[in-house]
């Protein structure tokens, strides 16, 4: 029968007694930076080219016995998971291996850097089709390694890395913390985070998605026909590298941003038991398990968006947090979140010619997060319209006044420490969906975009009684671009998007009276692109 991991990444419409994906990744080359490999294994013989690159440290210990099958174990297994004939994800992909880990699985930052430079030079000398680089390794945070990954990613290479097996925040490790890299955590057959002894998969905002990473059958370096189960985020990353190879083979022109958005879009949502993660990491960790798209073609018409969390601002009074989108993405909205509820909102601002999302901590606050909604919107022209505090009883308002511009997100930011306390809520006048409203003491920011065929609508969900969480979702065919809370709800901790749902979080209801102050309204802005849909139909 089909191994559980291959079944798990197969969309339901393809489910069968065997794994038979529509495209095997034959146009893509996958580089593997790992241990040496047993290239004559029946799973990978003829599929993996062992390069002459080797940069590894000496093995520790005087009694270390270098046994070939042990030296090759990790790399052989991963090569098999990516492209193995029997148990591989992308059965058509070809691979090249670089040895950067020694027989004990240890490497150096310098060895990995030189390996990445080797790939960059190979790409310049002999450009081929799309490239995927698999980095199934994790070490302490390294600014220089992250920068090298950024350079290679900006040269058009897709980098996929393991989140790490330290049951810790992936942002503390490299290359997992590099924003340009697709960082993968590990789940098991029950879609739960993988436990490895006393440790387990890493988590947090630097993880892009999870993938099967426990009890994964693959090529064993024991013998040329041997198979073995291995576990870890390396195996999970190998699955995503294989899926990426198949997506790129079907659509070779996909950019890194487009690929990442598709990986997120086609993932299984909300299947991971978040209780495994530390409480403060649950909201930051994506509840996504990688899967192949139901069809390798025809996804171009969708408006893809993802949520990007900033690092924590820290608790100082004037602390801020910044969330950024990838170079090819548009920032369509900006929100903020604070566990203490003490925050001074958020704003979109230009930084280096690109919009970023900045959240502001408040006096006595434990810190804030900025949350960016990053979307793929070709030919978009977006700008931010700001209304300063109105000081008028009706509150502050701002709308998109340019012809053809639509509202994609609302943000509000205030200077006073406790905005909204004892203030009545401001109600949005009906029939004016293209505007943002806020407190009279707040400055309001509207994200206004013009793009061919772009249309947006506002959806609200209000609950009169206090509740810890209020949600509103966009319906099928629409994509959530903006998520905010209607002003007047002083106990709101913040708002953020989870997939296509806008979540507004409030303080523990036991601390809130059930006056009108208790009313919580979540406001979602849902968009779609008729232009992308029409273009897709023409192509087909």
């Amino acid at each position: 029968s089909i191994p559980w991991n291959l079944e798990r990444i197969t969309p339901p419409r393809y489910r069968a007694d065997e794994y038979q994906p529509p495209d095997g990744g034959s146009l893509v080359e996958v580089y593997l930076l790992d241990t040496s490999i047993q290239s004559d294994h029946r799973e990978i013989e003829g599929r993996v080219m062992v390069t002459d690159f080797e940069n590894v440290p000496e093995e520790d210990g005087t009694r270390f016995h270098r046994q070939a099958s042990k030296c090759d174990s990790h790399g052989t297994h991963l090569a098999g998971v990516v492209s193995g004939r029997d148990a591989g994800v992308a059965k058509g992909a070809s691979m090249r291996s670089l040895r950067v880990l020694n027989c004990q699985g240890k490497g150096t930052v310098s060895g990995t850097l030189i390996g990445l430079e080797f790939i960059r030079k190979s790409q310049l000398v002999q450009p081929v089709g799309p490239l995927v680089v698999l980095l199934p390794l994790a070490g302490g945070y390294s600014r220089v390694l992250n920068a090298a990954c950024q350079r290679l990613a900006r040269a058009g290479v897709v980098l996929v890395t393991a989140a790490g097996n330290f049951r810790d925040d992936a942002c503390l490790y490299s290359p997992a913390s590099a924003p340009e890299v697709i960082t993968v955590g590990a789940t098991n057959a029950q879609d739960q985070p993988v436990t490895l002894g006393t440790l387990g998969t890493n988590f947090g905002r630097c993880v892009d998605l999870f993938a099967p990473g426990e009890d994964i059958i693959g090529a064993s370096s024991d013998c040329s026909t041997c198979f073995v189960s291995q576990s870890g985020t390396s195996q999970a990353a190998a699955h995503v590298a294989g899926i990426a190879a198949m997506m790129l083979s079907a659509e070779p022109e996909l950019t890194l941003a487009e690929l990442r958005q598709r990986l997120i879009h086609f993932s299984a949502k909300d299947v991971i038991n978040e209780a495994w993660f530390p409480e403060d990491q649950r909201v930051l960790t994506p509840n996504l398990v990688a899967a192949l798209p139901p069809s390798t073609h025809g996804a171009g018409w969708q408006l893809f968006c993802r949520t990007v969390w900033s690092a924590h601002s820290g608790p100082t009074r004037m602390a801020t947090a910044v969330a950024r989108c990838a170079p090819d993405e548009e920032l369509l909205s900006c929100s903020s979140f604070s566990r203490s509820g003490k925050r001074r909102g958020e704003r979109m601002e230009a930084q280096g010619g690109k919009l970023v999302c900045r959240a502001h901590n408040a006096f006595g606050g434990e810190g804030v997060y900025a949350i960016a909604r990053c979307c793929l919107l070709p030919q978009a022209n977006c700008s931010v319209h700001t209304a300063p505090p109105a000081e008028a009883s009706m509150g502050t308002r701002v709308h998109c006044h340019q012809q053809g511009h639509v509202l994609t997100g609302c943000s509000s930011h205030w200077e006073v420490e406790d905005l909204g306390t004892h203030k009545p809520p401001v109600l949005r006048p009906r029939g004016q969906p293209n505007q943002c409203v806020g407190h009279r003491e707040a400055s309001i920011h509207a994200s206004c975009c013009h793009a061919p065929g772009l249309e947006c609508k506002v959806k609200e969900h209000g609950i009169p009684a206090p509740q810890e969480q209020v949600t509103v979702a966009c319906e099928e065919g629409w994509t959530l671009t903006g998520c905010s809370a209607l002003p007047g709800t002083s106990h709101v901790l913040g708002a953020y998007a989870v997939d296509n749902t806008c979540v507004v979080r409030s303080r523990d209801v036991s601390t809130t009276g059930s006056t009108s102050e208790g009313a919580v309204t979540a406001v979602a802005i849902c968009c779609r692109s008729r232009h992308l849909a029409q273009a897709s139909q023409e192509l087909q």
């Epitope: 065997e18 794994y19 013989e45 029997d86 041997c226 189960s229």
Partner: antibody, heavy 119, light 113 residues
Framework: QVQLVQSGAEVKKPGESLKISCKGS????????ISWVRQMPGKGLEWMGL????????RYNRKFQGQVTISADKSISTAYLQWSSLKASDTAMYYC????????????WGQGTLVTVSS | DIVMTQSPDSLAVSLGERATINCRSS????????????LAWYQQKPGQPPKLLIY???TRESGVPDRFSGSGSGTDFTLTISSLQAEDVAVYYC?????????FGQGTKVEIK
Amino acid sequence: QVQLVQSGAEVKKPGESLKISCKGSGYSFTNYYISWVRQMPGKGLEWMGLIYPGDSYTRYNRKFQGQVTISADKSISTAYLQWSSLKASDTAMYYCARDYYSRPLSDVWGQGTLVTVSS
Amino acid sequence: DIVMTQSPDSLAVSLGERATINCRSSQSVLYSSNNKNYLAWYQQKPGQPPKLLIYWASTRESGVPDRFSGSGSGTDFTLTISSLQAEDVAVYYCQQYSSFPITFGQGTKVEIK
């Protein structure tokens, strides 16, 4: 259901060429290896080699390397075993079998093709 | 190449009695990484293709009666038919699949006494 159907018995003269076939059905032919096994009259089983139809990767038993060619046409889910110049010692029953990582040569075997080479 | 040697070459057992076939490999087919023996047993009846009975030295293929069992590790293996039935008359082969070329034992013919 999953099955492998082999071509019929062949009677050939020494020096002639021959290509026998093995057609898979009921499963994704490209995703499983096909092995060929020889059984000479009254003798035991000998593994000759295998092919992975997905990419036409082959692996031969050294004993048979250069004596036979294993190939496949994935468009018609068929694997082949061929000889360019038969010898009397090639007289045998030839079996194809589906091969997968969790099994050696699985329970899916062809019915066998009897090849007789005689002048 | 790994050489597989079976004993005995033939075996006559009364109906309902135990039949034991041994197989020895010229090198170990046990691998530490998954602690599995890459050894299988096949049954072949006259005019039929072989049928897989046991793999990983002791795992019974689905549909195979539980009177068939496999044991052993490393280089020495045994196939046991706990209570011989008339339909068990056949030639039995052991096979290693730990390295290429895959090799079979010479076969053991089981008959009814």
